[in-house]
Interface confidence: low
């Protein structure tokens, strides 16, 4: 057992049939020693009496919010929450695996650049009795601080009959130094908690490794005279890390006809425009990704042939 | 070439190069080995490794001010890395091809190394660890992180010089 | 000559988890690998997994993974093996070895883990 | 991952008799980096044989390794009393070491 935060308990309990549970001692926070009695939850039967009560902790039953009283006052609590290892694994219930970059992936992490600011979310089908607290550092030794502020609930989808809830939360590492070859990981904890029942998920990067771009913005179209020709012009996004000179973009120009199966040119750059054939009907899409290290090419930003 | 006692690198040749040792880098990867290390997570190791680090100069700022702190920080990493790639680890079982492009990768280290630091003017580098030869395993699991660390480590050394030639080339 | 010494017998309970200790003498423990092989009552050898102290990576067999976690503190010349969320069949002799190009030549004595309730 | 598969699973044996262990791999062992190991009853391994083929430090000179792709033999030219054990073929030819499951020779 161990505390979570004031007055809230985590019970590690293995998990299988006829599994023994674990012996819980609850001591009521008072100056008080006699007449004590205890309850749990909103019933009213009195579970023991004294300063301690020892209980048995075997299924959700037996977690929730203990109550030590005095005489009809209420001297303290203590909120008790099970933590299962199934077969010797921690339980995974409450987030749901995105499956990728690969199995068992529930926490998704993104930066647009390299100021130490990045985003994390997770998926759940859960709607009520929700909470979700996060925790990050960089290093876990001797960590240095990344400031996480609250999970938000981000995005709601319909998933056939089923409803799934997206949730998000920002960081920022306290002192990101940008131009510096990370040697140490980020570390994301976050524990999550539903009803009576606690669960912990961790993700570790660098944040080099999470990089996505916005995509280019201000994408232009001139046409070249007297030609099938038009030159694509864009910019860097402003949400990139500046210099440019520096935090270089590397760029993929894509032509795509109306229907999917007709042949798409690419053209690769490193510089902000290109000049590509505009056929009819036809769109235009430009991505970016970082010139030096291959992370996620940002989304497409697109414009007409027309 | 980088001349002793702090006069300026050939930027743009030692841009074109580090653009390149990155495209190799990263088409080395898939050939350390058949399995997705990332499974195991990037876990703190012992820094055995030349990191470029916050206090070494290689910001813009930095770089304006005084670029050799940066520069030999980078030789350093380059002439560490380029003993590792021609170590046994590399060289032993499983062996790469030898059009591989980790001796493409090897060799280019060598070449931006020798840009930023002609014959006969000596900065300190790093000792290389000295590894007996080792099993296929352990070879295997330290081409992977090497790899991967050296993408990392050339990432930055091709910003320096891709914001050197920009904005420091005479 | 290089010596491998193991820490003592321990007997675990279901879900717990145990930590061998495997301490090397008389030669450069960075310069090597150390594999970490188990052995059942009766039965063959099992090779759990192996570290590279000078580097601090570590390498596991599919079986073991999530569970087992080698590390090496050099400092101590010492290797290490945790196995979490032991069951009975966990019940065996764990040995650590020095991992060469020429295979494992010089082992540990082994350490009986036993796993009962 | 590579499986070892070694044959006889008992080997019965007079002293002076030679001893013929097979050692077959489910896939080309890279290198041919297989080691054989003899052990006696509670106690650790022992290197005999590396590289399939090389005889580790203060092994007797009747212990003989050969044997190359997937087809491997340990030999033991005449069987002193000593020299009865398990004996394992391992390869580490790969990321992930393996072990064959052992050939016990026992005396007839």
């Known amino acids: 057992i161990w505390e979570l935060k004031k007055d809230v308990y985590v019970v590690e309990l293995d998990w299988y049939p006829d599994a023994p549970g674990e012996m819980v001692v609850l001591t009521c926070d008072t100056p008080e020693e006699d007449g004590i009695t205890w309850t749990l939850d909103q019933s009213s039967e009195v579970l023991g009496s004294g300063k301690t009560l020892t209980i048995q902790v075997k299924e959700f039953g037996d977690a929730g919010q203990y109550t030590c009283h005095k005489g009809g006052e209420v001297l303290s609590h203590s909120l008790l929450l099970l933590h299962k290892k199934e077969d010797g694994i921690w339980s995974t219930d409450i987030l749901k695996d995105q499956k990728e970059p690969k199995n068992k992936t529930f926490l998704r992490c993104e930066a647009k650049n390299y100021s130490g600011r990045f985003t994390c979310w997770w998926l759940t089908t859960i709607s009520t009795d929700l909470t979700f607290s996060v925790k990050s550092s960089r290093g876990s030794s001797d960590p240095q601080g990344v400031t996480c502020g609250a999970a938000t609930l981000s995005a709601e989808r319909v998933r056939g009959d089923n409803k799934e809830y997206e949730y998000s939360v920002e960081c920022q590492e306290d002192s990101a130094c940008p131009a510096a070859e990370e040697s140490l990981p980020i570390e994301v904890m976050v524990d999550a908690v539903h009803k009576l029942k606690y669960e912990n998920y961790t993700s570790s990067f660098f944040i080099r490794d999470i990089i996505k771009p916005d995509p280019p913005k201000n994408l232009q179209l001139k046409p070249l005279k007297n030609s099938r020709q038009v030159e694509v012009s864009w910019e860097y996004p402003d949400t990139w890390s500046t210099p440019h000179s520096y935090f270089s973009l590397t760029f993929c120009v894509q032509v795509q006809g109306k229907s999917k199966r007709e042949k798409k040119d690419r053209v690769f750059t490193d510089k902000t425009s290109a000049t590509v054939i505009c056929r009819k009907n036809a769109s235009i899409s430009v991505r970016a990704q970082d010139r030096y290290y291959s992370s996620s090419w940002s989304e497409w930003a697109s414009v007409p042939c027309s | 070439r980088a001349v002793p006692g702090g006069s300026s690198p050939a930027w743009t040749q030692c841009q074109q190069l580090s653009q390149k040792l990155c495209t190799l880098a990263w088409s080395a990867h898939p050939l350390v080995g058949h399995m997705d290390l990332r499974e195991e997570g990037d876990e703190e190791t012992t820094n055995d490794v030349p990191h470029i680090q916050c206090g070494d100069g290689c910001d813009p700022q930095g770089l304006r001010d005084n670029s050799q702190f940066c520069l030999q920080r980078i030789h350093q990493g380059l002439i560490f890395y380029e003993k590792l790639l021609g170590s046994d680890i590399f060289t032993g079982e499983p062996s790469l091809l030898p059009d591989s492009p980790v001796a493409q990768l090897h060799a280019s280290l060598l070449g931006l190394s020798q840009l930023l630091q002609p014959e006969g003017h000596h900065w300190e580098t790093q000792q290389i660890p000295s590894l007996s030869p080792s099993q296929p395993w352990q070879r295997l699991l330290l081409r992977f992180k090497i790899l991967r660390s050296l993408q990392a480590f050339v990432a930055v050394a091709a910003r320096v010089f891709a914001h050197g030639a920009a904005t420091l080339s005479p | 000559q290089v010596q491998l010494v193991q820490s003592g017998a321990e007997v675990k309970k279901p879900g717990s988890s145990v930590k061998v200790s495997c301490k090397a003498s008389g030669g450069t423990f960075s310069n090597y690998a150390i594999s970490w092989v188990r052995q059942a009552p009766g039965q063959g050898l099992e090779w759990m997994g192996g570290i590279i102290p000078m580097f601090g990576y570590a390498n596991y067999a599919q079986k073991f993974q999530g569970r087992v976690t080698i590390t090496a503190d050099e400092s101590t010349s010492t290797a290490y093996m945790e196995l979490s969320s032991l069951r009975s069949e966990d019940t065996a002799v764990y040995y650590c070895?020095?991992?060469?190009?020429?295979?494992?030549?010089?082992w540990g004595q082994g350490t009986l883990v036993t796993v009962s309730s | 991952d590579i499986v070892l598969t070694q044959s006889p699973a008992t080997l019965s044996l007079s002293p002076g008799e030679r001893a013929t262990l097979s050692c077959r791999a489910s896939?080309?062992?890279?290198?041919?980096?297989l080691a054989w190991y003899q052990q006696k009853p509670g106690q650790a391994p022992r290197l005999l044989i590396y590289?399939?083929?090389s005889r580790a430090t203060g092994v007797p000179a009747r212990f003989s390794g050969s044997g190359s792709g997937t087809d491997f033999t340990l030999t033991i030219s005449s069987l002193e009393p000593e020299d009865f054990a398990v004996y394992y073929c391992?390869?580490?030819?790969?990321?992930?070491?393996?072990f064959g499951q052992g050939t016990k020779v026992e005396i007839k």
């Open positions: 070895a020095r991992d060469i190009y020429a295979g494992m030549d010089v």
């Open positions: 590289g399939a083929s």
């Open positions: 391992q390869q580490y030819s790969h990321l992930i070491i393996t």
């Open positions: 896939q080309s062992v890279l290198g041919n980096y």
